[in-house]
Interface confidence: medium
């Protein structure tokens, strides 16, 4: 079954290469277990950036080496992607799956265009 997922159209990463955005989903029921996946679309290629499964009311737990962190609040997930470079500029799509209890629901957002600008190197100082 499908559900709506909403996310901002555009986000600008900060000078440290960190971008944050909220992914919001229209939960048709009371899910207790939710899986959030961030996908990056460049041209026609879609790659998984990170994923986390969490229990409602608990923190999102990404893998230790993940570039993503996040928190949840109700039907909103606050996602932060770190370590971005200019070459990582692209469309970042939020996918939400309501894993438990049945029925299974899945929704995919329209994507957030994240712009990353590499900082200018500091000039040498005498």
């Amino acid at each position: 079954k499908a559900m709506h997922v909403a996310q901002p159209a555009v986000v600008l990463a900060n000078s440290r290469g960190t971008a944050s955005f909220v992914c919001e989903y229209a939960s048709p029921g009371k899910a207790t277990e939710v899986r959030v996946t961030v996908l990056r679309q460049a041209d026609s290629q879609v790659t998984e950036v990170c994923a986390a499964t969490y229990m409602m009311g608990n923190e999102l737990t990404f893998l230790d080496d993940s570039i993503c962190t996040g928190t949840s609040s109700g039907n909103q997930v606050n996602l932060t992607i770190q370590g971005l470079r200019a070459m990582d500029t692209g469309l970042y799509i939020c996918k939400v799956e309501l894993m438990y209890p049945p029925p299974y629901y899945m929704g995919i957002g329209n994507g957030t265009q994240i712009y990353v600008i590499d900082p200018e190197p500091c000039p040498d100082s005498d």
Partner: antibody
């Protein structure tokens, strides 16, 4: 069955404001993103604005950004389009549409005509 | 914004003819391509969504195909009620954009 009924159109002078409404019924309004699409007389379709199911996010076309604001009241099952600083080129039939899960506008209202003329 | 080039802009056909309308997008849209039918003085109606899925209540003579940047709407056997204007629309990327329309007229 799904029904979308627009109202609020009419003749307005350039520079003035108007608010369109769209009353929705026959589905769970608060679970769907909604849009406004317009069609100038004898012309094609042009997307104007969209709002997420809860109203958290809204998006507007470049041609109306800063002048038009989309909003919704889920307790009243109603979608709105507040239009200000109206121009002659805003003259069109304005349609309210529901966006389904595969990004298609699956249901449309009958439209309401907005005429901007001095 | 993604540009939508729809062709032809108009065509004349007879009842029973096979009609094909094409839509080309300026960027890859991963199949988020929809087709609408509009009759004079009426609101558009959804025919095909996600490239090839038939909306409920739409006759099976309508079909859609395509991928990447090239998409097609086909009416296998034109009926009297099919004379109308047809629009393609993409929502692979914001903002959603429409083609210029194809008017199908009686020959």
């Amino acid at each position: 069955q799904v029904q979308l009924v627009e109202s609020g159109g009419g003749v307005v002078q350039p520079g003035r404001s108007l608010r369109l409404s769209c009353a929705a019924s026959g589905f769970t309004f608060s679970n769907y993103a909604m849009s406004w699409v317009r069609q100038a007389p004898g012309k094609g379709l042009e997307w104007v604005a969209e709002i997420s199911y809860s109203g958290t996010y809204s998006y507007h076309s470049d041609t109306v950004t800063g002048r038009f604001t989309i909003s919704r009241d889920n307790s009243k099952n109603t979608l709105y389009l507040q239009m200000s600083s109206l121009r002659a080129e805003d003259t069109a039939v304005y349609y309210c549409t529901r966006r389904d899960y595969d990004n298609e506008m699956d249901y449309w209202g009958q439209g309401t005509l907005v005429t901007v003329s001095s | 914004d993604i540009q939508m080039t729809q062709s032809p802009s108009s065509l004349s056909a007879s009842v029973g003819d096979r009609v094909t309308i094409t839509c080309r997008t300026s960027q890859v849209i991963t199949n988020y391509l929809n087709w609408y039918q509009q009759k004079p003085g009426k609101a558009p109606k959804l025919l095909i969504y996600y490239t090839s899925r038939l909306h409920s209540g739409v006759p099976s003579r309508f079909s859609g195909s395509g991928s990447g940047t090239d998409y097609t709407l086909t009416i296998s056997s034109l009926q009297p009620e099919d004379f109308a204007t047809y629009y393609c629309q993409q929502f692979g990327k914001r903002p959603p954009t429409f083609g210029g329309g194809t008017k199908v007229e009686i020959k």
